[in-house]
Amino acid sequence: EQAPGTAPCSRGSSWSADLDACMDCASCRARPHSDFCLGCAAAPPAPFRL
């Protein structure tokens, strides 16, 4: 985890202001509307599992 203004999140993760933590970009497949997904420079998410 990081505090705002410090070093960026590790590769594959992005800062969530809502959760005050670095979050996995991979989870944007399941939860694409999460605030941190905007910071995830990944391929468009595949259709989710449901």
Partner: antibody, heavy 119, light 111 residues
């Protein structure tokens, strides 16, 4: 420090009911999806049920083996969630864990509670 | 449902050597970017503990002796060098779809 504190469990007769509870602390409970996972020597680790967050309309999902028998619910105001189990059978015997996930993996786990279904 | 097959069911590895555990999914659990496979360690009387998420991402606080690899249907957990404290049962789990399913577990003994 993240904690998931479980209560409930014990011995119940076949056909009986039991309610398990899990109280969370140390993380943003309302944003997380919550699950129950059970473990038995016969079936190993088995995901049982999931309840999603308010932003996901509190959607619930169940393993086929418990559909119509188990009901998962949550109370965000008190950071707790529940598993109501009805019409219990011997095959429901096991250790039941509550767990939190943001989306994919089970990050935090409760200590586990034993359920025995036997006459 | 996606069936997760773990091999071997048990193994004994000498202290300081490498332990390799395999997990095969009955269908692909990967996109072009991420694999939806996770690994856990469980010691007797304790709940499972997350080790590796998304096939190869080490969970915070987990020693770098643990590593994960693989994509599609075939995945591997490596522990090197193994330590006494690694005696446990290890499980894989997919999150590709509901129901989430786990492998049958691999019991690791340190010689």
């Amino acid at each position: 420090q993240v904690q998931l504190q479980q209560s409930g469990g014990g011995l119940v007769q076949p056909g009986g009911s039991m309610k398990l509870s899990c109280i969370a602390s140390g993380f943003t409970f309302s944003s997380y999806w919550m699950s129950w996972v059970r473990q038995s020597p016969e079936k190993g680790l088995e995901w049982v049920a999931e309840i999603r967050s308010k932003s996901d309309n509190y959607a619930t999902h169940y393993a086929e083996s418990v559909k119509g028998k188990f009901t998962i619910s949550r109370d965000d105001s008190k950071s707790r969630f529940f598993l109501q189990m009805n019409n219990l059978r011997a095959e429901d015997t096991g250790i039941y864990y509550c767990s939190s996930t943001y989306a994919d993996y089970f990050h935090y786990w409760g200590q586990g509670t034993d359920l025995t279904v036997s006459s | 449902d996606i069936v997760m097959t773990q091999t071997p069911a048990s193994l004994a590895v000498s202290l300081g050597q490498r332990a390799t555990i395999s997990c095969r999914a009955s269908q692909s659990v990967s996109t072009s970017t991420y694999s939806y496979m996770h690994w856990y360690q469980q010691k007797p009387g304790q709940p499972p503990k997350l080790l590796i998420k998304y096939a190869s991402s080490l969970e915070s606080g987990v020693p770098a002796r643990f590593s994960g690899s693989g994509s599609g249907t075939d995945f591997t957990l490596n522990i090197h060098p193994v330590e006494e404290d690694d005696t446990a049962t290890y499980y894989c789990q997919h999150s590709w779809e509901i129901p989430y399913t786990f492998g049958g577990g691999t019991k690791l003994e340190i010689k």
